[in-house]
């Protein structure tokens, strides 16, 4: 169950979407994508902290023994919770063609 | 495969409302950077840009023209809907509407003839 | 809105011939696309960004240019180059499409 979207540790600070702009050149991509030449990417940025927005069962259990062994067990991870596609224009061998990826944007997020 | 199709009325009377369907398939409008676009022909001439619906419902519109035409779409349908008021003869040519992925007419329909008379 | 210019209107060529297209317009763009059209159908992109080829276009076609000056050219004519040409901007709104260039073959 997804719980816990109060962030105790103050505005901004837990685990959200966050959109970070970014050029083709930023992302390494210049020789083979055309368009767009700027990029929103969207993306999971900030802390898990106790049972905030944890995905499952399992995060729950990762949050509560991070809290008895931080050595050997990590704190969750915020990561995409789900993806929005999104269409490049991208060079080929063949030309210039589409190609939509269905993973490329972050829709929202969760502690995992 | 990403095709399209065009629909509308075929003939019309001036001073009436054109509507225009375009029914797509292959790709999703909630993709982003994937919109549709609409260009007009009339018999012989030219390409003219008429307006452009986006993946999160931003539209524009040929200004020449920006104060007749209405877009829309239906996301889950996979249709968009353009409609040009107030029509007389000059508004007489073959309707295309095309996939737009950023800035670029990649895949067209095939045309609808329409004729204002 | 910005103009775009094709001349020649029409243009006649022989088989092997290479011929350039041009386009010329009113303000600077950044890039320009190049669209074929056959009698009786839809358009479609032969040069994307000025001088990308693209996919399942033959290399005989190529695009070059810059600022408000932008050409196309087919080294080596074809019979089923016959088309009208257009070129297109979309570096401000209203997107605008040039009047057309129809090629003919002798």
């Known amino acids: 169950a997804r719980n816990g979207d109060h962030c105790p540790l103050g505005p901004g600070a837990c685990c959200a979407l966050h959109t970070v702009r970014a050029s083709l050149e930023d992302l390494g991509w210049a020789d083979w994508v055309l368009s767009p030449r700027e990029v929103q990417v969207t993306m999971c940025i900030g802390a898990c902290p106790s049972q905030f927005r944890a995905a499952n069962m399992h995060a729950q259990i990762k949050t509560s023994l991070h809290r008895l062994k931080p050595d050997t067990v990590p704190a969750p991870c915020c990561v995409p919770a789900s993806y929005n596609p999104m269409v490049l224009i991208q060079k080929t061998d063949t030309g210039v063609s589409l190609q939509t990826y269905d993973d490329l944007l972050a829709k929202d997020c969760h502690c995992i | 495969q990403v095709t399209l199709k065009e629909s509308g009325p075929g003939i019309l009377q001036p001073s009436q409302t054109l509507s225009l369907t375009c029914s797509f398939s292959g790709f999703s409008l909630n993709t982003h950077g994937m919109g549709v676009g609409w260009i007009r022909q009339p018999s012989g001439k030219g390409l003219e840009w008429l307006a452009n619906i986006w993946w999160n419902d931003d539209k524009y519109y040929n200004s020449a023209l920006k104060s007749r035409l209405t877009l829309s779409k239906d996301t889950s349908n996979n249709q968009v809907f353009l409609k040009i008021s107030s029509v007389d003869t000059a508004d007489t040519a073959t309707y295309f509407c095309?996939?737009?992925?950023?800035?670029?007419?990649?895949?067209w329909g095939q045309g609808t003839l329409v004729t204002i008379s | 809105q910005i103009v775009l210019t094709q001349s020649p209107a029409i243009m006649s060529a022989s088989l092997g011939e290479e011929i350039t297209l041009t386009c010329s317009a009113s303000s600077s763009v950044r890039y320009m696309h190049w669209y074929q059209q056959k009698s009786g159908t839809s358009p479609k992109v032969l040069i994307y960004?000025?001088?990308n080829l693209a996919s399942g276009v033959p290399s005989r076609f190529s695009g070059s240019g810059s600022g408000t000056f932008y050409s196309l050219t087919i080294s080596s004519v074809e019979a089923e180059d016959a088309a009208d040409y257009y070129c297109h901007q979309w570096s401000s709104y209203p997107w605008t499409f040039g009047g057309g260039t129809k090629l003919e073959i002798k």
């Open positions: 960004s000025t001088s």
């Open positions: 095309a996939q737009v992925a950023w800035d670029w007419f990649a895949y």
